[in-house]
Interface confidence: low
């Protein structure tokens, strides 16, 4: 293939491939019809002069994961069709002005994962067709104004894993085509008031794991067409109320792990397209009437690990859309029987670790698509008469880890589980807390001979008489986890975490999908 | 200090039943899984069961014939097999959590006539 | 049932030297990221000891010469200085999904 170096190989489709820790140069002499060319894990610690003169139609070439240290001005001399250029994951620490120099085909410039400690406005003055401009996983500490205002043309800037403390307003004021803006991991304590405004074609904000502590109202008035913004463990401990008032467009948005203690009515929205919000890991106390309200199409709704302790029953007005809520790990004792009313197509709802002393009867009551009920670690002793009745396709309810109160009131739940076994799979089976003659014993076995009168007055509705047949033999096999389901998940129902650490964030939150900020 | 200190040497006809105990120690009893396993002489390991307050999970093989149960108050742990045969003869572990972290010293059952 | 196969079934080596067991399991036993693979040690008249657990985690009080790797179906425990004190039969075992199940033991041996 017109004269291929012997530690690469080079294909019919003029690609050439060289990889490996014996090569220590640019390997010569590389065939000269060469588009793609790639220099992969070799031991190569700079670029000379002009090692690619002879393959000008050159139009991608990567140098990555090699040991590349210092590049000579004139490095990329001669290759004017290039589109795509990797320097990602070398350990460049200075980039020489005009390296770039020539390069007018340019789309794509990959200079992430090296040890770049700055960047000039030269470096990129050249760039005009640039596309494409990754930086993240470097040392950089500021962006000097000026820096990208020549390449108009940019949608993707990813500037994440770096040390920038703060960013000029004007540092991306001419970015008009950004559709990327990448700021994650850094340091950044506060954003201008203006700095977005330039970005009026802007889809993705990424902030998140930065420092921020207070969001200026205006911030985001001009990004119209955000679709995803990620504004997760910063330090943000209130939202202005109207700084998300301009995003029409938004389909995601993360809030995690941030300091907030309440939501104003009204802060979200209008959001027609938002589809998930994430608010868990703040210190939210409250949810008032109508806080969603604006969030017509949401789907996925997580604010556990907060210490909401009051939900107004008008909290999740407007939620007609809402599959997944999760409420766990939070401050709640009671909530009010209409409270999920709006919520027709909810599948999942978590709510387990929290200090739910009861529940009212009707409070699944629209909910009649619900799948997975999680109200395990609360405080309930007993529950409703037909509280889950209606509920045809619930196929997994958590009730471990209550105090269950094991006298006759509980027969009828007794029975229902019995009756539900195979259906619902329990993992791990409630235990009886209560009287002491039965303490420890697993709710769903207690002997009716055993199981003491109630000498209370019952906080749920007495339930009428509900025929059992211990000796059934059709019954599942009551002293075990149901037989139906296998123990796939035991990291989740009963291994000590100290043990070991899951990184999976969906068994942390009782959440059902992966996702991430 | 962990311990699970197992009864002591059973020797049983076939036919019977025979329970043994697992006493835990130095932790808090409730919180862990604790496993029954057992041993043929010479032989491998094979899993019987788990108990964990009060839910229960067998080995299919053994299904029917081990019977786990524990008591709280005493920290302790109880199997029970029935209907013994030769082929019973083995030693049997307790040990606890997921892991299998700590054993105890095992409890040799003999069944022969 | 997810059947564990161990090899060698013995394994002669000399001390200070590198000793490597190998375990394969009939199906993935990866679950949340996580292989739930663990290694066991048992020396005559005694019960087993926890060295690793979920793949490449060692257990308390484990000496840094065992390390455990692999994920999905393959795994290996090794030993990267034999001591006279490690004599013994090791065991894999998964505890992916019940019925937990163990390989059937390797023998190591000083030669």
């Known amino acids: 293939y017109h004269g291929c170096p012997s530690e690469c190989t080079c294909s019919r489709a003029s690609q050439v491939e060289c990889t490996g820790a014996r090569i220590v140069a640019v390997p010569t002499p590389l065939p000269w019809n060469a588009m793609s060319l790639q220099i992969l894990n070799t031991h190569i610690t700079e670029l000379n002069e002009s090692p690619f003169l002879n393959i000008s139609a050159l139009i991608a070439l990567r140098i990555e994961k090699n040991e590349l240290s210092r590049i000579t001005p004139g490095a990329f001399r001669n290759l004017g069709s290039l589109r795509y250029l990797s320097l990602a994951n070398n350990k460049l620490q200075v980039l020489p002005i005009g390296l770039f120099q020539g390069l007018d085909s340019l789309e794509s410039l990959l200079l992430s994962s090296n040890q770049l400690l700055q960047i000039q406005p030269a470096h990129f003055s050249q760039c005009s067709n640039l596309k494409e401009l990754q930086l993240h996983g470097n040392h950089l500490e500021y962006i000097p104004d000026g820096a990208f205002d020549h390449l108009v043309g940019l949608t993707k800037l990813n500037l994440g894993k770096n040390s920038l403390t703060h960013i000029s307003p004007r540092v991306f004021q001419h970015l008009g085509n950004l559709q990327v803006l990448r700021l994650y991991e850094n340091r950044l304590t506060d954003i201008p008031m203006g700095t977005f405004d330039g970005l009026v074609n802007l889809q993705e904000l990424a902030l998140q794991q930065n420092q921020i502590g207070l969001l200026s109202p205006g911030l985001f008035h001009n990004n119209h067409n955000l679709q995803r913004l990620y504004l997760s463990n910063n330090h943000i401990s209130q939202l202005p109320p109207s700084v998300f008032m301009q995003l029409p467009q938004l389909n995601r948005l993360t809030l995690f792990g941030n300091s907030l203690k309440e939501l104003s009515p009204g802060i979200f929205g209008p959001m027609p397209n938002l589809r998930e919000l994430w608010l868990y890991d703040n210190h939210i106390s409250s949810l008032p009437d109508n806080v969603f309200s604006n969030l017509r199409q949401l789907q996925v709704l997580i604010l556990s690990r907060n210490q909401i302790s009051f939900i107004s029953p008008g909290a999740f007005n407007g939620l007609t859309e809402l599959r997944e809520l999760s409420l766990h790990t939070n401050a709640l004792q009671d909530l009010d029987g209409n409270v999920f009313r709006m919520l027709a197509n909810l599948q999942n709802i978590s709510l387990q670790n929290n200090r739910l002393r009861q529940l009212p009867g009707n409070i699944f009551a629209n909910v009649n698509g619900l799948m997975a009920i999680q109200l395990q670690n609360n405080q309930l002793e007993n529950l409703p008469l037909g509280i889950f009745d209606h509920l045809g396709k619930l196929c997994e309810l958590r009730l471990y880890d209550n105090p269950w109160r094991c006298d006759s009131d509980i027969l009828p739940l007794r029975n229902w589980l019995l009756l539900n076994q195979p259906r619902l799979g329990t993992d791990t089976v409630p235990v009886c807390f209560s009287p002491a003659n039965v303490r420890g014993q697993s709710l769903i076995i207690i002997n009716v001979n055993v199981a003491v009168p109630s000498v209370h007055v019952p906080e749920v509705p007495s339930y009428p008489e509900t025929p059992w047949y211990p000796d059934t033999p059709s019954y599942p096999d009551t002293t075990s986890v149901s037989s139906t389901t296998e123990l796939t998940s035991p990291v989740e129902d009963y291994t000590d975490l100290t043990t070991i650490q899951v990184t999976d964030d969906r068994s942390v939150w009782g959440m059902t999908q992966a996702q991430s900020g | 200090e962990v311990q699970l200190q197992q009864s002591g040497p059973e020797l049983v006809k076939p036919g019977a039943s025979v329970k043994m105990s697992c006493k835990a120690s130095g932790y808090t009893f409730t919180s862990f899984v604790i496993h029954w396993v057992k041993q043929m002489p010479g032989q491998g390991l094979e899993w019987i069961a788990y108990?964990?307050?009060?839910?229960?999970k067998y080995n299919e093989k053994f299904r029917g014939r081990a019977t786990l149960t524990s008591d709280k108050s005493s920290s302790t742990a109880y199997m029970e097999l029935n209907s013994l045969t030769s082929e019973d003869s083995a030693v049997y572990y307790c040990?606890?959590?997921?892991?299998?972290?700590?054993w105890g010293q095992g409890t040799t059952l003999t069944v022969s006539s | 049932d997810i059947v564990m196969t161990q090899s060698p079934d013995s394994l002669a080596v000399s001390l200070g030297e590198r000793a490597t067991i190998n375990c394969r399991a009939s199906e993935s036993v990866d679950y949340y990221g996580i292989s739930f693979m663990n290694w066991y040690q048992q020396k005559p008249g005694q019960p087993p000891k926890l060295l690793i657990y979920?793949?490449?985690n060692q257990g308390s009080g484990v000496p840094d010469r065992f390390s455990g790797s692999g994920s999905g179906t393959d795994f290996t425990l090794t030993i990267s200085s034999l001591q006279a004190e490690d004599v013994a039969v090791y065991y894999c075992q998964q505890s992916k999904e019940v019925p937990y199940t163990f390989g059937g033991g390797t023998k190591v041996e000083i030669k």
């Open positions: 979920a793949a490449s």
């Open positions: 040990a606890r959590d997921f892991y299998f972290d700590y």
């Open positions: 108990i964990y307050n009060d839910g229960t």
